[in-house]
């Protein structure tokens, strides 16, 4: 009987010899559940598992807790890989997180965290980050220490208000905090003075809604 080869992340895919960008099927060890993820095999040495992408507003990111848990969208376009998969993956070994951002004037920037993981669902997929470098701000636009994940139907932020309902999208809101990469997508010339847009405060300020974002992870020892 032929042995089925499975990959837990895009780093494993890359090391197996598949060095072309594209959508691959990933499976966690000791699991039969598969997810489809986009693998970036070119940027910074390749092996990056894309866990979020915004590029054109084609996908609605104002989703429920369950949808953010299991993932949604199109791995070739705009999507969210899924909190449960990312939580399990990032608790099995050490991962780095790179967030790549594009504005509407042709500029690009990134934030790189040397250690990233999500707590389990029991702790509302709380985000843990350490060691920020990059060009998208000297201060982390994801509040530190990390917050619990909130969605329109799960208010786990640190505001008396409901950040996810107010700003739209699921995110690790503080009260409500300096970022939200899952906010409303605003087209060019409608992207300024928007409180509920795609925000990364320490790069573009509070009212600027970005053109594109990619969140990607890779094992720290890649």
């Amino acid at each position: 009987k032929e042995e089925q080869i499975s990959f837990r992340d895009c780093a494993e895919v890359f090391k197996s010899g598949h060095t072309t960008n594209g959508v691959y099927t990933l499976t966690l060890p000791n699991s039969t559940e598969e997810v489809k993820a986009y693998c970036d095999m070119e940027a910074g040495g390749g092996g990056w598992t894309i866990i979020q992408r915004r590029e054109d507003g084609s996908v609605d990111f104002q989703r429920t807790w369950k949808e953010y848990k299991v993932g949604f969208g199109n791995p070739s376009g705009e999507y969210w890989l899924g909190n449960e998969f990312v939580s399990q993956l990032t608790n099995q070994q050490r991962y780095v997180l790179k967030i790549h951002l594009k504005d509407w004037e042709g500029n690009e920037a990134y934030s790189l965290y040397e250690h990233f993981y999500l707590s389990s669902e029991e702790l509302n997929y709380r985000i843990h980050l350490k060691g920020l470098t990059g060009t998208a701000g000297k201060i982390s636009s994801i509040s530190q220490p990390g917050n619990d994940f909130s969605t329109k139907d799960a208010d786990n932020d640190k505001c008396i208000c409901k950040c996810s309902q107010m700003l739209t999208g699921g995110w690790w809101f503080d009260a409500c905090g300096p970022s939200n990469l899952n906010g409303m997508y605003y087209p060019q010339r409608q992207n300024t003075n928007k409180f509920n847009g795609i925000k990364w405060y320490y790069w573009k300020g509070s009212g600027y809604s970005l053109k594109g974002t990619t969140m990607m992870i890779r094992p720290a020892d890649f």
Epitope: E122, N124, P145, A154, D155
Partner: nanobody
Framework: EVQLVESGGGLVQPGESLRLSCVAS????????????MYWYRQAPGKERELVAI????????TYADSVKGRFTISRDNAKNTMFLQMNSLKPEDTAVYVC?????????WGQGTQVTVSS
């Protein structure tokens, strides 16, 4: 199932103080009280439940409703699995049932509440 038990309520006159406690138990294996963000709510007769204060799992970050800011202080003792609400300069409009809450995996666990009545 997590159990939350409030105490410390009572009848006081305007301007007086009370200290509420909420003791938590029954967290799943591998988790402790210190892992969880906690909340105090209140519900007055005929009114909607109101979020009063939030405290982060480490106790360092606190948020208050405008109506209680400067008068109420939320705190916690993680070694004793207990959260507190120190209420000073109480007003008649603070009269309500005060309930503690924890949110886990998109579900809420609630205590039974403790009655606070502010009246002269």
């Amino acid at each position: 199932e997590v159990q939350l038990v409030e105490s410390g309520g009572g009848l006081v006159q305007p301007g007086e103080s009370l200290r509420l406690s909420c003791v938590a138990s029954g967290f799943p294996s591998g988790f402790t009280f210190s892992d969880y963000q906690m909340y105090w709510y209140r519900q007055a007769p005929g009114k909607e439940r109101e979020l009063v204060a939030i405290i982060s799992n480490d106790g360092l970050r606190k948020t208050y409703a405008d109506s209680v800011k400067g008068r109420f202080t939320i705190s916690r003792d993680n070694a004793k699995n207990t959260m507190f609400l120190q209420m000073n300069s109480l007003k008649p409009e603070d009269t309500a049932v005060y309930v503690c809450n924890v949110r886990r995996a998109n579900r809420d666990d609630w205590g039974q509440g403790t009655q606070v009545t502010v009246s002269s």
